[in-house]
Amino acid sequence: IAAHVISEASSKTTSVLQWAEKGYYTMSNNLVTLENGKQLTVKRQGLYYIYAQVTFCSNREASSQAPFIASLCLKSPGRFERILLRAANTHSSAKPCGQQSIHLGGVFELQPGASVFVNVTDPSQVSHGTGFTSFGLLKL
Amino acid sequence: IAAHVISEASSKTTSVLQWAEKGYYTMSNNLVTLENGKQLTVKRQGLYYIYAQVTFCSNREASSQAPFIASLCLKSPGRFERILLRAANTHSSAKPCGQQSIHLGGVFELQPGASVFVNVTDPSQVSHGTGFTSFGLLKL
Amino acid sequence: IAAHVISEASSKTTSVLQWAEKGYYTMSNNLVTLENGKQLTVKRQGLYYIYAQVTFCSNREASSQAPFIASLCLKSPGRFERILLRAANTHSSAKPCGQQSIHLGGVFELQPGASVFVNVTDPSQVSHGTGFTSFGLLKL
């Protein structure tokens, strides 16, 4: 069971990143699915290595004081959403903006029907060029 | 099937990074090989988690305007070279140069005879000290 | 065999990061254990994908000239400690400090009783908020 999906620019104002089965994507079988273009949902309980990579372009003067944060989050059936992993990068002083990449990854126990998704502080700063921003998992 | 190879400084002017089976490297068996010191080639079709880490040292004034980009690329038999993953980091203002690390990783379907390699915008900026820059894969 | 442990602030002056089985941690069975809150120790020989993520907050003026370096290290029975992976990030000019995240990961052969741990140049700069700093492995 494995998946690798590709970022998709979105007109939505949500902080949850959008993904698509496009380009050199992976969706091994129907035991993992991409739901609503925003979350990877698994049908089998078990240990999964889950990862996300986010490339963004920001400028210190044009951004809020707070850093750019990418969060890998979990929604299990009958449970509240929770953060699994976070990474933070301070905005660049480069103009018009400076690109930076964040990589998150870890091993987590998922229940049947559990969904994982990626949140960012400012989706408008995310880079969607080939290979820059992606999201995936593999069952151990 | 798994491999982990270590960066090697090169006098070549190519943007493709060079690797060696040295230090604490891994080469599980002959179903994955390091070819010409530049690419990992697999003999078996399947899903692979492929990763690379690149540490580099650069300075904004001494570098081009463009960020430092590391790309994980694929060459499959009978197909053309393509990008799987990219990461970008804007150059540091630290002098003489500021070190930064990039990590790439994802799950991809590889065909028999497929090769993966790592491209960077400026190989002369790459750090080759122990553990700083490496490249590997594992078959799921 | 898999583990994922969560960073723990420590009053110790050691450069070795401290970890705990807390939050959304993983410890699949007793073939991998967290020893002294500082190292993951495996009982079985084999290939492991080992990873660490470290988020830190530093300022160029308040830090040494040297970059922030995170190292993944190995101690095998009857062998000296050695570095497996390192990543480096130059300190930010943001005030009071600028957050940055480092991700390390690779495939390594471990012997029975081998331990892996994470060293950083300045543990006081490490961020311990939910999901920011973690450490884990999985047996292939």
């Epitope: 060029g129 | 197909r79 393509r82 | -």
Partner: nanobody, 116 residues
Framework: EVQLLESGGGLVQPGGSLRLSCAAS????????MAWVRQAPGKGLEWVST????????YYADSVKGRFTISRDNSKNTLYLQMNSLRAEDTAVYYC?????????WGQGTLVTVSS
Amino acid sequence: EVQLLESGGGLVQPGGSLRLSCAASGFTFARYQMAWVRQAPGKGLEWVSTISDDGDSTYYADSVKGRFTISRDNSKNTLYLQMNSLRAEDTAVYYCAKLDKLFDYWGQGTLVTVSS
């Protein structure tokens, strides 16, 4: 239906320059990596260059590095190959290619002949 129409080929002397164009239609051009490949008389297809969808990353075969430049204009759905310092061994039919997951699509090609 994917269509790729190459143009700009011709006869040129060694050391000369040419600019090839490839007009793309039938797909969302800006979402795909693109490449130039070539086939010399009596030889197999040879990869020349690849460009990312955003144009930020470019890759070249060692044989053309420093002489050829790949670029794209996503607003015009067009791929380009600027070829300088041409050599006799660059003589070939040049094809532009759309890089998809399962297949690489390419056009009819344009002939480049380098001869004095």
